[in-house]
């Protein structure tokens, strides 16, 4: 999906109002220094591409985050503010949800969510630079 035509301001507002709180809740008990940020992004569409990938694509050691509250809210936000996102992405991510067996917050998942927080911060920063 090409995130170029999204309403970035509205995505930022949703992130600051609600998604960020759920990401921080997920990370509770860990320190920001516990993980190194290895994933980066260069502009707003690129940041959303990376956020989409880390949130919804299963990885070997973190099966899927798609059922978490922050993921459901991310999906809703992208569906609302990125025209055409629902048609191209929702069915694909629905299938991934079925892969998740039990709700175990592994260290690898915590690391992945730490990367997500970094990507979202980067998304906000690139937004501020543009204004």
């Amino acid at each position: 999906y090409d995130f170029t035509n999204c309403d970035f301001q509205k995505i930022e507002a949703d992130y600051l109002r609600t998604i960020s709180k759920d990401l921080i809740t997920y990370m509770s008990g860990t320190k920001s220094t516990d993980f190194n940020n290895t994933v980066s992004c260069s502009n707003r569409p690129h940041c959303l591409t990376e956020i989409q990938s880390l949130t919804f694509n299963p990885t070997p050691r973190c099966a899927s985050l798609a059922k978490e509250m922050f993921a459901r809210k991310t999906k809703a936000t992208l569906a609302l503010w990125c025209p055409g996102y629902s048609e191209t992405q929702i069915n694909a991510t629905q299938a991934m949800k079925k892969a998740r067996k039990s709700k175990v917050t592994t260290n690898k998942c915590l690391e992945q969510v730490s990367q997500l927080l970094g990507l979202w911060r980067r998304f906000i920063r690139t937004l501020l630079k543009k204004q």
Epitope: D14, R17, T18, R72, K73, A76, A79, L80, P83
Partner: antibody, heavy 120, light 111 residues
Framework: QVQLVQSGAEVKKPGSSVKVSCKAS????????INWVRQAPGQGLEWLGV????????IYAEKFQGRVTITADTSTSTAYMELSSLRSEDTAVYYC?????????????WGQGTLVTVSS | QSALTQPPSASGSPGQSVTISCTGT?????????VSWYQQHPGKAPKLMIY???KRSSGVPDRFSGSKSGNTASLTVSGLQAEDEADYYC???????????FGGGTKLTVL
């Protein structure tokens, strides 16, 4: 069963406000959009706005901006539509309609409608 | 004045086909594949018939079909039946600010 149940008919004076409720049951309320659509007697359908409780987003039709407020209480699975500064032209049946999950612009479930009459 | 334009009326005899048009702009119908159609019988709430231009809602007979060309969407009802007599409304997504636009409605009469 899966349904939307709206509050009863209202008679209001011009200049006053009305608040219509829409109680959802049988589905995960927060994940869907709750839209409000009205129909004046003998007229077509008109979209007022939508709320997506999951992310707390509301979008209003430009025509009603500043006059309509849509809210939701996830603890009771109830959405509300308040319309202020009522005039006779606001006399209509007001419907709440569920917007499909992540496809909030398709209304796949409707309430029974609430008749709001504005008369002095 | 509705943002999407529909003919006020359409008619056909039982067994015939009838097509209802819905004309918008490149900012709504032409810009997105997010057209839907609703059927409304007198005194009843509307019912979703077609979404995403041409997908039938569950329980809707395959006599109902949708299509789109440029800025115009169409609903075709083939093999008309008496119970198809109703008002039909098109809607289109119209961007993140306007969100949804309705057509003015078409009264379908089965002769």
């Amino acid at each position: 069963q899966v349904q939307l149940v709206q509050s009863g008919a209202e008679v209001k004076k011009p200049g006053s406000s009305v608040k219509v409720s829409c109680k959802a049951s049988g589905f995960t309320f927060g994940s869907y959009g709750i839209n409000w659509v009205r129909q004046a007697p003998g007229q077509g359908l008109e979209w007022l706005g939508v709320i997506v409780p999951l992310v707390g987003v509301t979008i209003y039709a430009e025509k009603f901006q500043g006059r309509v407020t849509i809210t939701a209480d996830t603890s009771t699975s109830t959405a509300y539509m308040e319309l202020s500064s009522l005039r006779s032209e606001d006399t209509a049946v007001y419907y709440c309609a569920r917007g499909q999950e992540y496809f909030y612009w398709y209304f796949d479930l409707w309430g029974q409608g609430t008749l709001v009459t504005v008369s002095s | 004045q509705s943002a999407l334009t529909q003919p006020p009326s359409a008619s056909g005899s039982p067994g015939q086909s009838v097509t209802i048009s819905c004309t918008g702009t490149s900012s709504d119908i032409g810009g997105y594949n997010r057209v839907s159609w609703y059927q409304q019988h007198p005194g009843k709430a509307p019912k979703l018939m077609i979404y995403e231009v041409n997908k039938r809602s569950s329980g809707v007979p395959d006599r109902f079909s949708g299509s789109k060309s440029g800025n115009t969407a169409s609903l075709t009802v083939s093999g008309l039946q008496a119970e198809d007599e109703a008002d039909y409304y098109c809607t289109s997504y119209a961007g993140t600010d306007t969100f949804v636009l309705f057509g003015g409605g078409t009264k379908l009469t089965v002769l």
